[in-house]
């Protein structure tokens, strides 16, 4: 069970890191291209990973102004890195009934980042709940 628990920890750490990166980007929201991006909200159960991939695919861009361009670009790149896979994630990938990215409401960068953070928090909570109930599925 040790490697299973280490895998769960790795997944949890990665999700938590993504929240920190989102928080970092929120400090530079005025230096992002003010483009409207698909921002899933109130994501239906079992479509979290689908919504997550919509956030990762979105074209968040630096406005290339000032000295913050490098940190913004690195942060955006890190947001797009694939997190460790989980059984729940693998199962969800096979679902064809989740909304397409284009069907989600488009929002400016500030709201986009806030919604991304909310989804990540929801996913952490679900992950913890499944651990509590003895499932190794998380």
């Amino acid at each position: 069970h040790k490697s299973s628990s280490q895998g769960q920890d790795r997944h949890m750490i990665r999700m938590r890191q993504l929240i920190d990166i989102v928080d970092q980007l929120k400090n530079y929201v005025n230096d992002l291209v003010p483009e409207f991006l698909p921002a899933p909200e109130d994501v239906e159960t079992n479509c979290e990973w689908s919504a997550f991939s919509c956030f990762q695919k979105a074209q968040l861009k630096s406005a290339n102004t000032g000295n913050n361009e490098r940190i913004i670009n690195v942060s955006i790149k890190k947001l797009k890195r694939k997190p460790p896979s989980t059984n729940a994630g693998r199962r969800q990938k096979h679902r064809l009934t989740c909304p397409s990215c284009d069907s989600y409401e488009k929002k400016p960068p500030k709201e986009f980042l806030e919604r991304f953070k909310s989804l990540l928090q929801k996913m952490i909570h679900q992950h913890l709940s499944s651990r509590t109930h003895g499932s190794e599925d998380s």
Epitope: Q8, M12, I13, R16, Q17, H125
Partner: antibody, heavy 117, light 106 residues
Amino acid sequence: QVQLVQSGAEVKKPGASVKVSCKASGYTFTDYWMHWVRQAPGQGLEWMGLIDTSDVYTIYNQKFKGRVTMTRDTSTSTVYMELSSLRSEDTAVYYCARYGPLAMDYWGQGTLVYVSS
Amino acid sequence: DIQMTQSPSSLSASVGDRVTITCRASQDISNYLNWYQQKPGKAPKLLIYYTSRLHSGVPSRFSGSGSGTDFTLTISSLQPEDFATYYCQQFHTLRTFGGGTKVEIK
């Protein structure tokens, strides 16, 4: 077992810089980010920032931005925290703490930095 | 920035007492709260994470509860080794610690 061993106490003059090290062992160094936290004498804990040990990505507490630099050396599994333009208020014990799943799960023993003219 | 306020800042209690420490966040932090214990001259140690989950090796007399802005750390029956300072810490947005609560011997 996980261990974080920090460098020894430092005495510095106002305006100088200090570089504190934290050597990690007992786990895969680049799998875990690292936090730095400080504690002034008789005071509470203050979060300074964190570093991604795999690629030196950093997130700093705005309060220390411009004065703090966090780096790492993967060959020795060591992270560093450098604080510049020191003032007497920077006298504190500085801790490194491992970025666990949802908390700072392991801490170094602390490094006292004393700033005095 | 999210501010964390702990109360009381210190308390006196006897071995066997039930002790309750509270922590209030300046905004909703959901369950993103941890508790640490620190003894004089030592580094802090993680006790409870995500409001109510016991870190490995922590005795079950420690428990945490709360949600949103108000949180509680309870020691059901104080032991000699529990005399220390306790800190809450939010991790909803970056990290902030409370001012600490010192638990002293009565």
